[in-house]
Amino acid sequence: LNTTILTPNGNEDATTDFFLTSMPTDSLSVSTLPLPEVQCFVFNVEYMNCTWNSSSEPQPTNLTLHYWYKNSDNDKVQKCSHYLFSEEITSGCQLQKKEIHLYQTFVVQLQDPREPRRQATQMLKLQNLVIPWAPENLTLRKLSESQLELNWNNRFLNHCLEHLVQYRTDWDHSWTEQSVDYRHKFSLPSVDGQKRYTFRVRSRFNPLCGSAQHWSEWSHPIHWGSNSSKENPFLFALEA
């Protein structure tokens, strides 16, 4: 029986092989139990974590992970050399930078060592699974009496990232947001000097170097102005 699973992250279909063994009527052997789905994320192209829900197993099982790259010079099957554990049971594998090849199809295989025929294979496009670190060093600059410019830094090549800026005043119930491309500059043309503003930014590996759906964590917020800003115009750029 060959079952195709549609993965939710825009990657290639994952083909999972379930092997049926001879069995008594009205029962299935352990080899037919589906293995948990493996989820991989590449953090800032520094390392990758591939994890699975170990608690979904009917009994504690140290599942093993192998990987390789399809149709490439790196197509030799590799064993996981750095397992992640949850309550002393394997629940993931960490791969280092030298083992990450973004633009080759990554094949990951999960296996039950006690039942070797029970295995699941998924194919992933790693460039769609990159999550950058949160933006850092937010700064605000006054361009004119009513215009602010927000700048920030990323610990990755700027041109690979797009950004989402959110801001609000103390009077607002919700954030206003604005998409920003790889140039990573944002300006607010009309600032009310009576209000205190809060800004934050997150980044995504899209659309130039990959097609990731997941955003980074939010930056630390930065603030501008205060309720008493008329009396004290130098109260600005207060880091949270």
């Epitope: 149709n71 090549l157 690979c160 659309p207 130039l208 170097c209």
Partner: nanobody, 117 residues
């Protein structure tokens, strides 16, 4: 074996144009973003432009935006850079690289662009 061969450089007057090409082999060209970088005499390698694997997205250094245009032909495994309104400060060795320009792998041999009157 990854091979990148740049061509199309030359001597041109300020305000002139050139079209650089980079022919790639030894890897799945259509799977990779591709990047142009340059190195002026006595300077470090400077990122110029990157194009997505499908050609649908591009990015440019501020110094060349609006004057240079990156493009690619995946069927021919070839990357291009159209250089318009050239300035003397564009004088450099121009390199194409596989990927997004993080310095690995090393670029090809390069093609020299000299802008002078």
């Amino acid at each position: 074996q990854v091979q990148l061969q740049e061509s199309g450089g030359g001597l041109v007057q300020p305000g002139g144009s050139l079209r650089l090409s980079c022919t790639a082999s030894g890897f799945s060209f259509s799977s990779y973003p591709m990047t142009w970088a340059r190195q002026a005499p006595g300077k470090g390698l400077e990122w110029v432009s990157t194009i997505a694997s499908d050609g649908g997205s591009t990015a440019y250094a501020a110094s060349v935006e609006g004057r240079f245009t990156i493009s690619r032909d995946n069927a021919k495994s070839t990357l291009y850079l159209q250089l318009n309104s050239l300035k003397t400060e564009d004088t450099a060795m121009y390199y194409c690289t596989k990927g997004y320009g993080d310095g690995t792998p090393a670029p090809g041999q390069g093609t020299q662009v000299t802008v002078s009157s």
